[in-house]
């Protein structure tokens, strides 16, 4: 599980996998979190040791048992990796260190007026990893207000020295604050040249890109597919850099895929984990454990829960199965990537979700959210199924949310169409985050058919569900993807990680929000919910969510949008935002249409002529 405690005056003995210099224990912990093998760390502040070479030393450690003996060392700080800690996992580090010079390769010097300006320059420079700034009181006049942009082979300082009137810090590119912008394109049949900084095996170019994004010196990559002509190079992901920051040349090459690090993306970074499961693929590596489980999703969950597990293979070979359970091979390697990838097997493979930062936070404390009501801004690609239902009469305005459940299907609330049943007036925007980004040129979907539940009555809370068939199917992208639906009559699953999203009012008498808001809300039992609504019947076709103290809730404009819950590493559409007594009121949970109760209806309405369901359902 997630262990956040720090141990003062303690040093873990043994287990070393890497060492580096970091300015404080928190940065050391972050490096441990992102290191594939690190479970524990020990940090030596300048005050804790006389040996100049070991000052600011950050020692990353691994242990088969998950722990190591602690020895007393005055001033030392030790702790755990934040793997499995959900929202606490972040490569973003904003702190500025006064009286400290972080050494590295100085590749750019300029005069600036403040340390913040220096940090901004570093963030906006593709090669800058960290910086030092000499203040106006620095002892050598010619160096005052100098901003030195730096990098190093490992992304951390090559040394850290105590030096008066110098301030240092890190690039804020991992905070998605770079002004550079990024190249999302993946280039098929193209190989990039330049310097290889690392070589790993990956099942596809997307995993390769994520690894590149979180590698300190990778600016772009080339991936050799599993049909590449040289067998020994198949599935090789080459992480690359160059002096200029861009490839100096590219060569057309069959069965190669190239692309760029997404570290310079302005709005959001990809999660530092790989959630996709690869059927018919085996991942080779060092065996950690073998266990019998029911289904590949449980295998992935087992790997995620076993903190040292990096990736897994779920075997469907008859000799590896008994009854409904099959062997789940939990594996690891030195670099966190498989040592061998085999295709055409009877296995399914994937990665641990231990670094997913939208993971289930029930295991450890989370960074608190502050506004939907009481929510926070969402980031790009976080809720790719969320759509905005807008009406264009004289002006155009957002009225409701909805959820993409298939290429041509959106699920929403029936009450969104009260008084507006004409399909021509509606415009559906998908793959967006900011409503202000919508212009007359922004593509939108039109409605082919509105299917309102036959038992829904205007101004009543019952059967508040509707399907929208789009005129043309949508392509799936990282920002526009369907949400899986629950299984019919899903009553046994206990959901503990549920979120509501929308552009709705941020207070009861508020206004539509520009940035898509998200709020983490606990489910409330129907029995408890019923007690809070003295005059309305809470049926088994409804689900309630809210905090006892109120303060966080869906509101006007969120209607029709999703209540999604993450279970076994998969997001599911549990509810459709429907109604409530006001917004975020104390003891008045929001009421949502329970999607599981309408699965027969959804399946019936979305059946195509060839009898295949046209929406996303969990495997």
């Amino acid at each position: 599980g997630c262990l956040t405690q720090l141990y003062e005056n303690a040093f873990f003995r043994g287990g070393d996998v890497a060492s580096m210099y970091t300015p404080n224990a928190q940065y050391c912990q972050m490096r441990c979190t992102f290191h594939p093998r690190c479970l524990l760390f020990s940090f030596l502040p300048a005050s804790s040791i006389n040996d100049m070479e070991k000052r600011f030393g950050c020692f990353l450690k691994d242990s088969v048992t998950g722990t190591l003996p602690k020895v007393h060392r005055t001033g030392a700080v030790s702790g755990h990796s934040l793997k499995q800690c959900g929202h606490q996992i972040s490569a973003c580090h904003r702190d500025i260190y006064k009286g400290v010079d972080m050494r590295g390769v100085n590749f750019n010097v300029s005069k600036v007026s403040s340390v913040e300006e220096c940090q901004k320059r570093c963030t906006s420079n593709i090669r800058c990893q960290f910086f030092s700034y000499a203040t106006q009181t620095f002892h050598k006049a010619e160096y005052r207000n100098n901003c030195l942009l730096k990098y190093s082979p490992g992304g951390t300082p090559t040394a850290i020295k105590v030096l008066s009137n110098v301030e240092s810090g890190f690039s804020l590119k991992p905070c998605a604050l770079s002004e550079i912008g990024c190249h999302m394109n993946i280039f098929q049949h193209l190989a990039f040249s330049d310097v290889d900084v690392a070589r790993v095996l990956t099942p596809d170019a997307f995993v390769c890109r994520t690894i590149c994004t979180y590698h300190p010196n990778c600016l772009f990559f080339t991936f050799y597919t599993n049909v590449w002509k040289i067998e020994s190079q198949r599935n090789v992901c080459l992480l690359k850099t160059s002096e200029s920051g861009t490839p100096s040349s590219s060569t057309p090459q069959e069965n190669t895929i190239s692309g760029y690090s997404l570290l310079t993306c302005k709005r959001t970074l990809p999660e530092p984990c790989h959630s996709k499961i690869y059927p018919g693929v085996d991942f080779g590596g060092e065996e950690l454990n073998v266990t019998f489980v029911k289904g590949v999703n449980v295998c992935q969950e087992t790997c995620t829960k076993m903190i040292r597990c990096q990736f897994f293979t779920y075997s469907l070979l008859p000799e590896d199965c008994k009854e409904e359970k099959c062997k789940c091979f939990l594996r690891l390697s030195m670099d966190g990537s498989p040592t061998r990838i085999a295709y055409g097997t009877q296995g399914s493979s994937g990665y641990s979700l231990r670094l997913c930062n939208t993971g289930d936070n029930s295991v450890c404390t989370t960074k608190t959210s502050t506004r939907i009501v009481g929510g926070t801004n969402s980031s790009w690609g976080e809720w790719p199924w969320q759509v905005s239902l807008q009406v264009k009469l004289t002006a155009q305005r957002h009225l409701c949310g909805g959820s993409l459940i298939g290429h041509q299907w959106v699920l929403t609330a029936a009450h969104c169409f009260d008084g507006l049943p004409l399909q021509d007036v509606w415009r559906i925007y998908s793959g967006i985050l900011n409503l202000s980004d919508i212009t007359k040129d922004t593509p939108f979907s039109q409605i082919k058919e509105i299917i309102i539940h036959q038992n829904y009555k205007v101004s009543e809370g019952n059967h508040d569900i509707a399907l929208i068939k789009l005129q043309a199917p949508l392509n799936y992208t990282e920002f526009q993807k369907p949400i899986c639906l629950p299984s019919k009559g899903d009553t046994s699953t206990i959901y503990t990680n549920c979120w509501v999203t929308g552009w709705g009012f941020s207070k009861e008498k508020g206004e539509i929000q520009n940035i898509l808001q998200k709020v983490n809300i606990p489910l409330v039992t129907n029995e408890e919910c019923q007690k809070r609504y003295q005059d309305y019947k809470i049926t088994q076709r409804m689900v309630c969510a809210g905090y006892k103290e109120g303060g966080k809730d869906a509101c006007k404009g969120d209607s029709g949008g999703p209540l999604v819950c993450k279970h076994n590493g998969m997001w599911r559409l549990v509810g459709i935002t429907s109604w409530g007594e006001g917004c975020a009121r104390r003891e008045q949970p929001g009421v949502y249409t329970k999607v599981a109760e309408y699965m027969d209806w959804i399946l019936e309405k979305t059946q195509s002529s060839d009898g295949k369901a046209q929406m996303q359902s969990p495997a």
Epitope: K457, E460, K531, R532, Y533, Q534, D535, Y536, K537
Partner: antibody, heavy 116, light 106 residues
């Protein structure tokens, strides 16, 4: 306007049964619960039970299980309370009420007198 | 079974008085208590639910408070139309009424 119209007063003999009705207007009984409450002369209120007319699910006060039977007819938007094996203890006003978590709107009540 | 003990059973007060009625539950009822007003020959009327939430249309002189097992209904400025019988109701576990408090003119 939400209204619950209860049937008229009943004078019944001990040991007999009686069926009281509660007809709703201004709302559909399927969308709510119908509760029944008893009030003996000059005494307090006692909850009898609750029916969900949509699926005929019922809940009763354990103390009076068997005495009362709740039913509903959604086509006529009417709920019923059947009382059996009547004794003088059952002489009371019987109220129907609609609501969710509790009784929000009440009918005018039906007086049942049990007398030989 | 949860028992509700209401007190006093009756009280005399004058217009303008502040009147307090209490209800004690035999177990913690998680604030799930409601208060009803009943006038002779009429059906009860919901005043307050969830300890302190005023039902719409009910004058603000009525207020509820309490937690755990002890709850109070307060009428801050008694009006002529407030002379009636008041009942508490727990709805945490099924439904149980208190015995009632008759508020009479002094």
């Amino acid at each position: 306007e939400v209204q619950l119209q209860q049937s008229g007063a009943e004078l019944v003999k001990p040991g007999a049964s009686v069926r009281l009705s509660c007809t709703a207007s201004g709302f559909n009984i399927k969308d709510t619960y119908i509760f029944w409450v008893k009030q003996r002369p000059k005494q307090g209120l006692e909850w009898i039970g609750r029916i969900d007319p949509e699926n005929d699910n019922t809940k009763y006060d354990p103390k009076i299980q068997g005495k009362a039977t709740l039913t509903a007819d959604t086509s006529s938007n009417t709920a019923y309370l059947q009382l059996s094996s009547l004794t003088s203890e059952d002489s009371a006003i019987y109220y129907c009420a609609k609501g969710g978590g509790l009784f929000a709107y009440w009918g005018q009540g039906t007086l049942v007198s049990v007398s030989a | 079974d949860i028992q509700m003990t209401q007190s006093p059973s009756s009280l005399s007060a004058s217009v303008g008085d502040r009147v307090t009625i209490t209800c004690e539950a035999s177990h913690d009822i998680n604030n799930y208590i409601a208060w009803y007003q009943q006038k002779p020959g009429k059906a009860p009327k919901l005043l307050i639910y969830y300890t302190s939430t005023l039902q719409s249309g009910v004058p603000s002189r009525f207020s509820g408070s309490g937690s755990g097992t002890e709850f109070t209904l307060t009428i801050s400025n008694l009006q002529p139309e407030d002379f009636a019988t008041y009942y508490c109701l727990q709805y945490d576990n099924l439904f149980t009424f208190g015995q009632g408090t008759k508020v009479e003119i002094k």
